[in-house]
């Protein structure tokens, strides 16, 4: 009933709660002396469904048969309309349309941990749209049945709040859930289980790792578990990996030796538990333990390369470079590199520890045979030394690789190709491709990069430390015993026209011709490898096309003579630079008038 219904009643047959698709009869009847004042025939009873008029009748009562009501709640209100007055509300009723509950499906129960409580879940099936009560029953030993009721609107989970104990782990328990509403009831199929079936152990806790004698090969993982745990599975992986290593262990009693860990690696460890070989379920994974394994002495050998630079008639500068060992080879934090330099005939040797650098430069006499050995050291020991005899890497012309080319290969890659040297190609033991940013001043501080290539290869893709719009000086060395030959080329991975032209800084007259001097274009404005310079000139105030002279680019060149200017004529001169992508805008303009005699 919606209100006090003082003036009349609304009755609903067969019930206020009906099955979807059913028909209801709604009757609205006035109580005695509650109609319109003058003539009862003037009583007009109107039935509303929500706010929409669905029926009316003159008299003391109204009957209406209603079909097709939707799922959910529908409100019907009866009103009285008299002449010359507003409609008066008589009474109302709510009708609840729904369905009987479907059989609950997939009833499943679990107890989290030996000390936990039994909780069950199920699938309710389609919504009944009615108040539906669920009762969960658990029957078992001693002829007992526990019951719990759920009065939530959407009930698909209940925790009994009781704990199954392992006194008789094989005892059978049966769970069943029953759904009841005004239109019917339905029970799930029973779910039968034992203690061992439904107890899901708590995840292991207090995980620790110990390395005996600080050695990765003697490692034990420890943890704590609930008392009845029989099985464990361990998973572990380096922190930077996505793939787990998995180990299953039985009766581990909270410890297990791990034999295949890598040194100086941060690992993540997790453990899960189970009570029985084939019954029950695995616990959740434990919280992760992260731990770093101890160092071991480095393995592998350093990749070492060098450069020689002539200083004067008696001295030469040797610059040694080496690459870091990979993490798996370093097997620890590299504390220093040990460099030993030895004169092979005299036996003199000097050793130096280098920290914080992967290069070393020294000056040695030009005479004698020199060798170097470089090794890497961590807290546990040193790698095997890499030994190199210092030689003139480009001395053997017949060993020079031929037809060296360098071509852009996608983003920030350069493909270097070559042909084997003329001298017996089978004599080549390896090729080394070396590259460094081209700096006009020949700066020795510019980082050096190299890679080694097998003797049967005639190409190499260089990608390390390659930047777009930078020109690289690339050398290909062919090494054979204590001899080497080399060829060089300039290359870039990406180029465009230079951003500016050279700046003319001086024009001088020499015997009827002029010498133009310029400043190099800053490296960051060259936008790749320069191919040519152009010098342009034309008579001042002339509209004619300028003349030009194109000069192949050479790193060290920064002046050029021009001998085709007329004396006592004022010329305007400027310069541009070209890469394979095009020509720069022109540099500064200079005026010059040749003073020499006319012919």
């Amino acid at each position: 009933k919606i209100d006090a219904c003082k003036r009349g009643d609304v009755t609903v047959k067969p019930s206020h709660v009906i099955l979807l698709g059913s028909t209801v009869n709604i009757t609205c009847s006035l109580k005695p002396r509650q109609g319109c004042f003058h003539y009862s025939r003037r009583n007009k009873l109107i039935l509303y469904k929500f706010d929409r008029r669905i029926n009316f009748h003159h008299g003391h009562s109204l009957n209406s048969q209603v079909t097709g009501l939707p799922l959910g709640t529908t409100l019907f209100v009866c009103k009285l309309a008299c002449i010359n007055s507003d409609e008066i509300q008589i009474c109302g009723a709510e009708i609840f349309v729904g369905v009987a509950p479907e059989q609950p499906q997939n009833l499943s129960c679990i107890q989290k941990g030996e000390q936990g409580t039994v909780a069950c879940t199920w699938e309710r099936g389609r919504d009944t749209h009615l108040y539906t009560e669920y009762t969960l029953q658990l029957s078992g030993p001693k002829n007992l049945t526990w019951q719990k009721q759920c009065k939530d609107i959407y009930c698909d989970y209940l925790d009994f709040g009781i704990n199954l104990t392992p006194e008789s782990p094989e005892s059978n328990f049966t769970a069943k859930v029953t759904a009841v509403n005004s239109l019917g009831s339905s029970s799930s199929l029973p779910s039968t289980f034992t203690f061992l079936d439904i107890v899901r152990p708590l995840p292991p806790w207090d995980i620790r790792i110990k390395f005996q004698k600080a050695s990765v090969s003697r490692c034990t993982l420890y943890w704590r578990d609930e008392g009845l745990v029989l099985l464990n599975r361990l998973r572990y992986r380096p922190s930077n990996s996505r793939l787990w290593n998995m180990v299953n262990v039985t009766k581990a009693k909270g410890r297990h030796d791990l034999l295949d860990l890598k040194p100086f690696t941060e690992y993540e460890f997790q453990i899960s538990s189970k009570l029985h070989l084939y019954k029950g379920s695995w616990s959740d994974w434990s919280e992760s333990l992260r731990a770093q394994t101890p160092e071991e002495e480095p393995t592998g050998m350093l990749d070492v390369w060098y450069m020689k630079r002539h200083i004067d008639y008696s001295r030469q500068q040797i610059s040694l470079f080496w690459k870091n060992l990979s993490v798996s080879e370093a097997r620890g934090k590299i504390l220093h590199y040990q460099v030993t330099l030895q004169e092979l005939t005299g036996g003199k040797a000097m050793t130096q520890n280098i920290t914080g650098h992967t290069s070393w430069t020294t000056v040695i006499p030009r005479t004698g045979n020199w060798a170097v050995a470089v090794s890497a050291a961590n807290s546990k020991g040193s790698s095997l030394p890499t030994r190199i005899n210092i030689m003139n890497l480009c001395e053997a012309g017949l060993l020079a690789p031929r037809q060296v080319s360098a071509n852009s290969e996608g983003m920030d890659n350069i493909l270097v190709t070559w042909q084997p040297p003329r001298k017996d190609p089978s004599a080549v033991q390896e090729y080394v491709v070396e590259w460094r940013e081209l700096h006009p001043g020949g700066d020795t501080q510019v980082p050096l990069n190299w890679l080694r290539s097998r003797p049967y290869n005639v190409s190499a893709l260089i990608s390390e430390n390659i930047k777009s719009y930078i020109c690289y000086e690339i050398r290909v060395y062919a090494l054979s015993g204590d001899q080497g030959g080399c060829s060089s080329i300039l290359g870039n991975s990406k180029h465009k026209a230079p951003l500016s032209g050279p700046h003319i800084n001086a024009i001088t007259e020499e015997k009827g011709s002029i010498l133009i001097s310029w400043n190099s274009i800053p490296v960051q404005e060259q936008m790749g490898c320069l191919l040519h310079y152009r010098i342009y000139w034309k008579e001042r105030d002339s509209n004619s096309q300028p003349q030009l002279c194109e000069i192949p680019y050479r790193v060290s060149q920064n002046s050029h003579p021009i001998n085709s200017l007329q004396p006592r004529v004022t010329y305007v001169l400027w310069m541009t630079a070209l890469t394979a992508a095009g020509e720069s805008s022109h540099g500064n303009e200079r005026e010059f008038c040749l003073q020499g005699k006319a012919n």
């Epitope: 001693k142 009781i162 704990n163």
Partner: nanobody, 129 residues
Framework: QVQLVESGGGLVQAGGSLKLSCAAS????????MGWFRQAPGKEREFVAA????????VYVNSVKGRFTVSRDNAKNTVYLQMNSLKPEDAAVYYC??????????????????????WGQGTQVSVSS
């Protein structure tokens, strides 16, 4: 100290119904689990039904399941046992008991007499065939 007084017992024909009540005083009723036991002449005291503190969880012996319903009204400090479809073998003295909360309720908790701290004097239920 909790005092428990049972009422509602009597003689009823087989198939009939009775509703037993147990009124508690002298303690915080809502903090106790409440149980019903019965004892027939010459037999041991037998567990019948119990209801946990919140009232949402109940436990029955299978011989009465579906016929008996235990309920409680914490506002009135009273626990009830509605007994329907009574059988001659249901005849006994019915006792109400109150058990203190335990740290962990197991499947068997509150189904043994020793789980309860306070007991009523009992009320006789007789069933004639």
């Amino acid at each position: 100290q909790v005092q428990l007084v049972e009422s509602g017992g009597g003689l009823v024909q087989a198939g009939g119904s009775l509703k037993l009540s147990c009124a508690a005083s002298g303690g915080t009723f809502s903090s106790y689990a409440m149980g019903w036991f019965r004892q027939a002449p010459g037999k041991e005291r037998e567990f019948v039904a119990a209801i946990m503190r919140s009232g949402g969880t109940t436990v029955y012996v299978n011989s009465v399941k579906g016929r008996f319903t235990v309920s409680r009204d914490n506002a009135k400090n009273t626990v009830y046992l509605q007994m329907n479809s009574l059988k001659p073998e249901d005849a006994a003295v019915y006792y109400c008991a109150a058990g203190r909360p335990v740290s962990r309720t197991s499947y068997y908790t509150y189904t043994y007499p020793h789980d309860y701290d306070y007991w009523g004097q009992g009320t006789q239920v007789s069933v004639s065939s």
